[in-house]
Interface confidence: low
């Protein structure tokens, strides 16, 4: 190999020893037959070489290096040019380094031709192995502006008091030319200036010089952001350092054009903007540090550029202000992430303020909009609590349990409407009247509606879960002993057309001591399925439930339990079934701990089952399943 | 330096009232979420409440709802919680701490004691 | 409202042995789980943010892990001065489920 470099070129050609790869033979340069482990050629001289293996590249790195005075001289501007050429270079990892110095008052700009440039952040790599490193200078201090790869949006990088910029190219990359120029411009007035180009949706991720070590104090440095005016941003700060402030705050500030506010001032805590049309900028500013504890400013921040769908422009009133104790939440469904570019979907207050989720609450009239490309990915949740504290003041005191319209409207799936009902202790019971009998969900007879009712316990103690019920069944009214939660859980987008199947009304009546009562009026055409509250868990300790069952006067019931034997096994106590006919009073009084269950009997009148649990043995719970069927009577037994 | 003072605590009787205070230094409480955390004597840690200043968003625990106010005011740093209807299974030590990925900061508490 | 069970409410250990503190949530949470320690008379302090994070100032023999709704903190090698009270706390501030804590593990010198 020869190199020669020419006289006043500035230029430094280092060739040493790399990162060591565990080879067992070593390798030198080769020098007039002298071999050694680093060679440096300077301007002016021209120097013949060979190594002494045959793959040099697993041993030596090169580095050339070109000082550029822009101090004492004209600035040589114009595209860069890569000198010695790479044809003339041994086949070795090489780093090209400019290092322009500047006055304080002139201003530098790189720009970098296509592909444009992607910052990547601390342990990252490039997938092609090229690197640009660009650093800048505060007096004699270096900052680090960031390393970037080829594949991005970053197009110009504008800085002031000079600039080190280096290309690291891997042996086997055939790259030429630098990729880049350089420009003088007037005084930027800050540290850097990063301009990022979207020609079409997409995203960027970007850092704070130094990132991840702190930014330098009481600075500021911009970025440019050129968006297609037909296109949205959305910006979100993935990761956040504050530093101790002695004096100023540390602040974004962006300048929107269009907006009346200019610059919009957010701190680094703060939800920032989303939902943006066409061009804007992001300036960061740090402040006057502690001197005893400075700590640090760091800022990596995602810019997420999209299409606005057709909902981005529609404003969705949400008026709750005639509500009380009412949350509804707007939220990412649960999905597995794919791999490739997925654009933001962002649910937005005042069409400014975007996040993945918000928490809208009762008492105002909110005003949303949404930035998302499919609002399937999005559900709602709302949490509703309705509450008695004076037992004298609600009794028999009802309320509807319907999704409010103004919900119903908004384009994003309800998945969940609880209502906590609340009920003084010991004072007051609760019912539950649906507009539609419904059907308890089993695995003999599945609910197949686009929506269900789950009714659970709400005392935090209690772990008791009463089932999931939908409409079109025999469960006329469900009664409770305390307090529950009813949520309406949908099922499938139909909902939105079933929603006038949903009626439920809560009603506060007397106190009483069992922990539920179902009332059921079978339908002769099926075959009602119940089953006992905490499937699969078992009915909790102490527990005690009953079924009121109304047979009419032309029918037989038939009452049928799904196996030989309850299973329960009790610690303490006794758990026991009584079947009572209503109109005799006659019952039979089964021990579930002991005795098989009932075969299957014939009732000609209502009557009762009641269900009541000891304190089991932990994995011999007490489940049951039974059904109920009406056939007419052949015989009248009256 | 980050600091969470409480202060207020005190000896109350059933049905009385108390306004504890957390003041804040070190930090703009308005950025933060700043919460309530009570201990029984002898007993876990129970978060009572809490308030993110900047929208004003408050939520409690079930078992002080209705009874207990959560407030803050920017101008003077400092968090309130204010207690009503007081009952003998209020008596703990108050907490309050800030809310930053997690309670990273906690005040040295204040005792409530509710007792006849 | 998720429960957090955390187990066991106490246990006894030398300085040097391992120790594993569950908490399990009663329903699927999100990562937004901290561990704290307590001394008696004592505020807690934070040990453990987002599940795993080892917060700062907080010896590396401190570790948190997520295994589906199971949580666990875990010191690698107990010393003196880590006989405390243990608590998993479940929730992020304004989340729609509550801030619960678990009932706390005493680790107490055998």
């Known amino acids: 190999f020869e190199i020669a470099l020419p006289r006043e070129s500035n230029i430094t050609v280092l060739i040493k020893l790399g990162t060591p790869t565990l080879l067992a033979k070593p390798c030198y340069i080769v020098i007039s037959k002298r071999h050694i482990t680093m060679l440096s050629i300077k301007s002016g001289e021209r120097i013949v070489f060979t190594f002494s293996c045959q793959s040099p590249e697993n041993h030596f790195v090169i580095e050339i290096q070109k000082n550029i005075d822009c101090m004492s001289g004209p600035c040589p501007f114009g595209e860069v040019q890569l000198q010695p050429s790479t044809s003339l270079l041994p086949t070795l990892n090489r780093t090209f380094i400019w290092d322009v110095k500047a006055h304080k008052s002139i201003g530098l700009e790189l720009q970098f031709s296509i592909p444009r440039l992607r910052q990547i952040g601390p342990g990252e790599s490039c997938p092609d192995g090229v690197t640009h490193s660009i650093s800048g200078r505060i007096d004699a201090t270096v900052v680090r502006i960031g390393t970037f790869c080829s594949n991005g949006t970053v197009s110009r990088i504008k800085m002031q008091e000079g600039v080190k910029m280096a290309l690291h190219l891997p042996w086997f990359h055939p790259r030429n030319v630098s990729g880049f120029s350089i420009a003088n411009r007037s005084s930027i007035k800050r540290l850097c200036i990063i301009e990022s180009v979207f020609e079409g949706e997409g995203s960027a991720t970007l850092m704070s010089a130094n990132y991840p070590e702190g930014f330098p104090e009481d600075e500021l440095m911009t970025w440019q952001f050129v968006v297609p005016a037909h296109l949205r941003a959305s910006v979100s700060f993935l990761n956040f350092n504050l530093s101790n402030c002695e004096r100023k705050e540390e602040r974004v500030e962006y300048y929107i054009p269009g907006s009346t506010t200019n610059p919009e001032v957010f701190k680094l805590e703060d939800k920032q903007p989303g939902n943006m049309a066409g061009n804007f900028n992001l300036s960061l500013q740090g402040c006057d540090q502690d001197a005893q504890s400075p700590g640090i400013l760091r800022l990596q921040f995602q810019v997420l550029v999209q299409h606005p769908q057709n909902e981005s422009n529609k404003i969705y009133v949400v008026d709750l202000s005639n509500e009380r104790a009412m949350s509804l939440t707007i939220e990412p469904r649960p999905v597995k992430q794919s791999r490739k570019f997925v654009p933001g979907c962002f649910v937005c207050l005042e069409s400014r303020t975007c996040s993945s989720n918000l928490t809208l609450t009762s008492g105002s009239k909110h005003k949303i909009s949404f930035l998302c490309d499919d609002l399937t990915r999005l559900w709602m949740n709302v949490e509703k609590t309705i509450s008695c504290t004076d037992h004298r003041y609600c009794q028999r005191k009802s309320y509807s349990l319907q999704v409010p319209s103004d919900i119903l409207h908004l384009p994003v799936e309800l998945h969940d409407f609880s209502w906590k009902l609340l009920v003084p202790k010991d004072r007051l019971s609760l019912v539950l009247v649906p507009a539609q009998k419904l059907q308890q969900h089993t695995h003999e007879k599945p609910c197949n509606t686009s929506f269900s009712y789950l009714v659970a316990s709400a005392i935090p103690s209690q772990d008791l879960y009463f089932g999931s019920f939908c409409p079109g069944g025999s469960i006329k009214q469900i009664q409770v002993k305390q307090n529950i939660s009813v949520t309406l859980r949908t099922f499938a987008p139909s909902f939105q057309q079933e929603a006038s199947r949903q009626g439920l009304t809560v009603s506060f009546i007397p106190y009483f001591k069992e922990e539920g009562v179902f009332t059921v009026t079978p339908d002769t055409k099926s075959k009602v399925y119940l089953r006992t509250p905490n499937w699969d868990r078992g009915l909790p300790s102490l527990t005690s439930v009953s079924w009121n069952i109304s047979v009419p006067r032309d029918q037989v019931a038939c009452l049928t339990f799904f196996k030989e034997r309850s299973g329960v096994v009790c610690q303490t106590g006794r758990a026991f079934m009584i079947i009572q006919e209503q109109r005799t009073r006659a019952e039979e009084i089964f021990s579930l701990d002991e005795d098989v269950l009932p075969k299957p009997s014939f009732h000609h009148h209502s009557f009762w089952v009641n269900i009541s649990n000891c304190s089991p043995t932990s994995g011999k719970q007490l489940d049951l399943l039974f059904s109920v069927t009406l056939t007419p009577r052949t015989v009248d037994l009256t | 330096e980050v600091q969470l003072v409480e202060s207020g605590g005190g000896l109350v009787q059933p049905g009385g009232s108390l306004r504890l205070s957390c003041a804040a230094s070190?930090?703009?409480?308005?950025?933060?979420?700043i919460h309530w955390v009570r201990q029984a004597p002898g007993k876990g840690l129970e978060w009572v409440a809490s308030?993110?200043?900047?929208?004003?968003?408050?939520s409690y625990a079930d078992s002080v709802k209705g009874r207990f106010t959560i407030s803050a005011d920017t101008s003077k740093n400092t968090a309130y919680l204010q207690m009503n209807s007081l009952r003998a299974e209020d008596t703990a030590v108050y907490y309050c701490?800030?809310?930053?990925?997690?309670?990273?900061?906690w005040g040295q508490g204040t005792l409530v004691t509710v007792s006849s | 409202d998720i429960q957090m069970t955390q187990s066991p409410s106490s246990l006894s250990a030398s300085v040097g042995d391992r120790v594993t503190i569950t908490c399990r949530a009663s329903?699927?949470?999100?990562?937004?789980v901290a561990w704290y320690q307590q001394k008696p008379g004592k505020a807690p302090k934070l040990l453990i943010y987002s599940a795993s994070s080892l917060y700062s100032g907080v010896p590396s023999r401190f570790s948190g892990s997520r295994s589906g709704t199971d949580f666990t903190l875990t010191i690698s090698s107990l010393q003196p001065e880590d006989f405390a009270t243990y608590y998993c706390q479940q929730g992020y501030a304004g989340s729609w489920h509550p801030i619960t804590f678990g009932q706390g593990t005493k680790v107490e010198i055998k």
């Open positions: 329903q699927s949470v999100s990562s937004a």
């Open positions: 308030i993110y200043p900047y929208y004003s968003s408050t």
């Open positions: 701490a800030r809310y930053y990925y997690a309670m990273d900061y």
């Open positions: 070190g930090f703009n409480l308005y950025s933060y979420y």
